[in-house]
């Protein structure tokens, strides 16, 4: 038999969500008598934060579930539950086990631009030119879908001149020119970029927006007949 179990559950889940199952075996007869019928209970929870009844256990199956709201990975990333298993359907001999419940990161933090305003200079006619790297911070678990950024140009790119991709390691948004800019036609572009995550937000979160002023630099072009 195992006397320490590990399991995990997403932070912020609703009461009733199943976490894990613990099992105790009893060689006694459980069909004609109660001698081998095991009843489970939670004896203690550490830490008792935000309070001491965050979990419950099904008396007969040993399934541990969330019973209260307020699981917050940033505050408490792991709980220790002391589980009691008692035979004779709760009236007999008792043994204890430990269940460690890891609280997993949910996408409860939005990526935020830092800074929110940028100025960049681009020579006209340059295609595939890196205009600017946009930086975001996100309090969710690094390299998880809840942390990885997705960028979208929301406005200012009427001629579809720009594209933005996510750097796989730094999580920065790399703004580049999709096609050449024309200084004579328009010497300044003001772009509005929104950032979200690969994973959907688990609650309503404000979306961060950045403003990028792109100055097009004149390039001396040969005369055309």
């Amino acid at each position: 038999t195992q006397d320490t179990f590990r399991g995990s559950v997403l932070e912020g889940v609703l009461p009733g969500t199943s976490v894990m199952q613990v099992t105790a075996t009893d060689e006694d007869d459980a069909i004609y008598t109660y001698n081998g019928v095991v009843a489970y209970s939670i004896h203690s929870q550490e830490p008792k934060d935000p309070h001491d009844l965050m979990f419950t256990i099904h008396r007969s199956t040993g399934t541990i579930s969330v019973i209260s709201s307020g699981l917050d990975r940033e505050k408490v990333p792991e709980y220790t539950l002391t589980i009691q298993a008692t035979d004779m359907d709760g009236d007999g001999s008792t043994t204890t086990a430990v269940a460690v419940v890891e609280i997993l990161d949910a996408n409860d933090n939005a990526p935020m631009f830092d800074p929110q305003k940028y100025e960049a200079h681009v020579p006209e006619n340059a295609v595939g030119h890196e205009v600017q790297r946009l930086t975001v911070t996100d309090l969710d678990a690094p390299n998880s879908p809840a942390w990885r950024a997705t960028y979208l140009i929301m406005g200012g790119d009427d001629g579809d001149h720009f594209t933005i991709t996510t750097h796989p390691e730094s999580n920065q948004g790399i703004l580049t020119t999709r096609k050449g800019l024309d200084f004579e036609a328009k010497n300044q572009h003001t772009l509005y970029v929104e950032v979200t995550n690969e994973a959907p937000f688990v609650l309503k979160l404000p979306t961060s927006t950045a403003t990028i002023v792109v100055h097009v630099e004149d390039v001396n072009e040969a005369p055309v007949f």
């Epitope: 320490t4 830490p47 917050d72 990333p77 792991e78 690094p142």
Partner: antibody, heavy 123, light 113 residues
Framework: VQLLEESGPGLVTPSQSLSITCTVS????????INWVRQPPGKGLEWLGV???????NYNSALKSRLSITKDNSKSQVFLKMTSLQTDDTARYYC?????????????????WGQGTTVTVSS | ELVMTQSPSSLAVSVGEKVTMSCKSS????????????LAWYQQKPGQSPKLLIY???TRESGVPDRFTGSGSGTDFTLTISSVKAEDLAVYYC?????????FGGGTKLEIK
């Protein structure tokens, strides 16, 4: 450079309380958990507890009723308070930084330790 | 709580020799969901604080010489020093972080002949 430095009273009389401060630099307490570990003279290491980035704590159940770990993020300080000290609490007390805040970082492993502060419980 | 047992309690070797030390856990430290062993190894030189050598039973901490190797799974773990140097004189501790409270082994004292 990541540094941790403990400061304590040195000598405590039996039944009194102990307060130790751990001051960190080179990293933020909002990014890394801090553990407390003690080592009696000539003996092994005993984990006392941890304070997580959000301020939650896990304690060694054998000492839980006597322990309190708190912190001040703005001052980069972590505080250990232990009540009802006895002579067998005589030890060197260390604060130690967890490798990371997430399980996949190996957060139970401690990658930076202070030099420790010696606490003697004697009348 | 989980009990960690280290052996031998002390050993003396000559410089250049290979040394192995054992750490046994009272129950498995392998978590089936991520196939990781929640075990770390530390080195504590005389008069100094412990230093992390290995985590996840076999992952060498940054800056640790490659003569230090951690191995094992479940309940039985080993720390190997492939070619001992004089500076390796220390006490070596294993620590589990599978369950609370975290617990350390009693240590293996490495002496140089």
């Amino acid at each position: 450079v990541q540094l941790l430095e403990e400061s304590g009273p040195g000598l405590v009389t039996p039944s009194q309380s102990l307060s130790i401060t751990c001051t960190v630099s080179g990293f933020s307490l909002t990014s890394y958990p801090i553990n407390w570990v003690r080592q009696p003279p000539g003996k092994g290491l005993e984990w006392l507890g941890v304070i997580w980035t959000g301020g939650g704590t896990n304690y060694n159940s054998a000492l839980k009723s006597r322990l309190s770990i708190t912190k001040d993020n703005s001052k980069s300080q972590v505080f250990l308070k232990m009540t009802s000290l006895q002579t067998d609490d005589t030890a060197r007390y260390y604060c130690a930084k967890s490798r990371g805040v997430y399980d996949f970082d190996g957060r139970g492993a401690m990658d930076y330790w202070g030099q420790g502060t010696t606490v003697t419980v004697s009348s | 709580e989980l009990v960690m047992t280290q052996s031998p309690s002390s050993l003396a070797v000559s410089v250049g020799e290979k040394v192995t030390m054992s750490c046994k856990s009272s129950q498995s430290l392998l978590y089936s969901s991520n196939q990781k062993n929640y075990l770390a190894w530390y080195q504590q030189k005389p008069g100094q604080s412990p230093k992390l050598l290995i985590y996840w039973a076999s992952t060498r901490e940054s800056g640790v010489p490659d003569r230090f190797t951690g191995s094992g799974s479940g309940t039985d773990f080993t720390l190997t020093i492939s070619s001992v140097k004089a500076e390796d004189l220390a006490v070596y501790y294993c620590q589990q972080y599978y369950s609370y409270p975290y617990t350390f082994g009693g240590g293996t004292k490495l002496e140089i002949k």
